[in-house]
Interface confidence: low
């Protein structure tokens, strides 16, 4: 806590400007009016305050807004955002995507902090769903964001948002998450033609059921082995040798290199040897 002391004569701040960097902590506390600070928050970032001075400014805002800052202040917090605790952020009601972007920009290039996680959580809950613009923004700053959500949270993602997802945004998703995302992707891309559809759906196929894989095998898609290896084992097991051959096209020869790994290993064990022999790869069931 900063002690309450009277402002020295002539030092009362009329505006938030560069001169304040020479104020001691107690002078900032005594001479800067919290309401003035709130209306001129956009100037704070342009002034090279020390972290200690920023603590004082935060303290003043906390006193002025004990129930949580208004969005007009939040949007201009800039580096002061790094001073906020998750508890502070839980009091906020952030509704503007521009506000979210402004605060994510401050944290850009760093790992997702508890503060950022809380901010995103508040924002998404306030919107009721993870819409396309929000997802676009979040994955731009944090490509792994989507895979940090629980399957329950992912269920609130509307199919239209899937268009914002890039392959690397799914790098760290586990099968349970892909189980939720795949049907949404299927719906989102349903009006695309065969080859375009496959390009878009490919990253989500770790959540595809057997019947969809069978359908893809009829479309001459030439799935690569990396994609095949990420398919659900339970979805691959019922596929026939002929279906896998059609699904993989020229990549079918890659099965030999993967014969000891799931799901290839388990699939081989389910096949009749004379069917496997038709591939000419020396696979042993």
């Amino acid at each position: 806590e900063v002690e309450k002391t009277a402002c020295p004569s002539g030092k009362k701040a009329r505006e938030i400007d560069e001169s304040l960097i020479f104020y001691k902590k107690w002078e900032l506390e005594a001479c800067v009016d919290a309401a003035l600070l709130a209306t001129q928050m956009d100037r704070v970032n342009a002034i090279p305050f020390t972290y200690e001075q920023l603590d004082v400014l935060k303290h003043k805002l906390d006193e002025l807004y004990p129930q949580g800052y208004p969005e007009s202040v939040i949007q201009h917090l800039g580096y002061l955002f790094l001073k906020m605790s998750p508890e502070d952020i839980r009091k906020w009601n952030v509704t503007s995507l521009e506000t979210l972007k402004a605060l994510l920009e401050v944290n850009k290039g760093h790992e997702m902090s508890p503060q950022v996680a809380t901010l995103i959580d508040r924002f998404v809950k306030g919107r009721g769903q993870l819409d396309k613009d929000t997802l676009d923004t979040l994955t731009a700053f944090y490509p792994g964001y989507l895979c940090s959500l629980s399957p329950e949270e992912l269920s609130s993602v509307p199919p239209s948002s899937i268009w914002a997802v890039r392959p690397q945004d799914l790098d760290t998703c586990d099968p349970r998450q892909l189980d939720v995302l795949y049907p949404k992707a299927r719906l989102a891309f349903q009006n695309m033609n065969g080859s375009e559809y496959f390009v878009k759906i490919q990253s989500f196929l770790g959540g595809a059921p057997t019947e969809d894989l069978k359908a893809l095998s009829q479309q001459n898609v030439s799935m690569d082995l990396a994609t095949f290896m990420k398919l659900r084992t339970d979805a691959v097991l019922p596929l026939t040798v002929a279906e896998v051959q059609k699904l993989l096209g020229p990549h079918v020869e890659g099965l030999k290199a993967e014969e000891r790994h799931r799901p290839v290993r388990d699939w081989i064990l389910r096949q009749r040897q004379d069917d496997l022999d038709t591939l000419g790869l020396g696979l042993q069931g």
């Epitope: 790992e111 490509p143 690397q168």
Partner: antibody, heavy 119, light 107 residues
Framework: EVQLLESGGGLVQPGGSLRLSCAAS????????MTWVRQAPGKGLEWVSG????????YYAASVKGRFTISRDNSKNTLYLQMNSLRAEDTAVYYC????????????WGQGTLVTVSS | DIQMTQSPSSLSASVGDRVTITCRSS??????LAWYQQKPEKAPQSLIY???SLQSGVPSRFSGSGSGTDFTLTISNLQPEDFATYYC?????????FGGGTKVEIK
């Protein structure tokens, strides 16, 4: 300070194998996707392989697929590249690089280790 | 695969010059483009990510612009330490691909 230190390079005959390692320090290794990039003598940069945070998802350039295997041990803060069936055209300096937290580009690189494939 | 084409492949310039390097992708990549600087016998260093965002610690004389298929790296006031090779790289989709490089030499 983030540091990535590659090792395991050397001279190997065509058809031989090598295992490269990349020891990471100064970062929460398990939080970042990692990658290998190579540079043949006097040539440009070529992306070789990438691996997700958990190690569960891997990507390969067509030129190495089926011969190279990327892996990671998060408990040892180490990234690996197992190179089999090596060819003369695999001769290069191999760099490991860390993917930025907020982006897919590579913000930190190791100093590189030279792999020479020759008989 | 997405092809990245850099031009010119080399250029000569003097200290204080403004240098512009372009990078074109064979298909749209949004803003998912990075620029790297590499000096002889050294590892590459990140300069720009997301087409225009400056990597921490990189001097402000470096700037990036563009989106879609056409991108530019500009060095506004060339310094002696800037003579190096510059590479662009797309990370919109796998396989990740680099441009062929642009060597900036002393005139």
């Amino acid at each position: 300070e983030v540091q990535l230190l590659e090792s395991g390079g050397g001279l190997v005959q065509p058809g031989g194998s090598l295992r490269l390692s990349c020891a990471a320090s100064g970062l929460t290794f398990r939080s970042y996707a990692m990658t290998w990039v190579r540079q043949a003598p006097g040539k440009g940069l070529e992306w070789v392989s990438g691996i997700s945070v958990s190690g569960g998802i891997t990507y390969y350039a067509a030129s190495v697929k089926g011969r190279f295997t990327i892996s990671r041990d998060n408990s040892k803060n180490t990234l690996y590249l197992q190179m089999n069936s090596l060819r003369a055209e695999d001769t290069a300096v191999y760099y490991c690089a860390k993917r930025g937290a907020a982006v897919g580009s590579f913000d930190y690189w190791g100093q590189g280790t030279l792999v020479t494939v020759s008989s | 695969d997405i092809q990245m084409t850099q031009s010119p492949s080399s250029l000569s310039a003097s200290v204080g010059d403004r240098v512009t390097i372009t990078c074109r992708s064979s298909q749209g990549i949004g803003s998912w483009l990075a620029w790297y600087q590499q000096k002889p016998e050294k590892a590459p260093q990140s300069l720009i990510y997301a087409a225009s965002s400056l990597q921490s610690g990189v001097p402000s004389r470096f700037s990036g612009s563009g989106s879609g298929t056409d991108f530019t790296l500009t060095i506004s006031n060339l310094q002696p330490e800037d003579f190096a090779t510059y590479y662009c790289q797309q990370y919109n989709s796998y396989p990740l691909t680099f441009g062929g490089g642009t060597k900036v030499e002393i005139k």
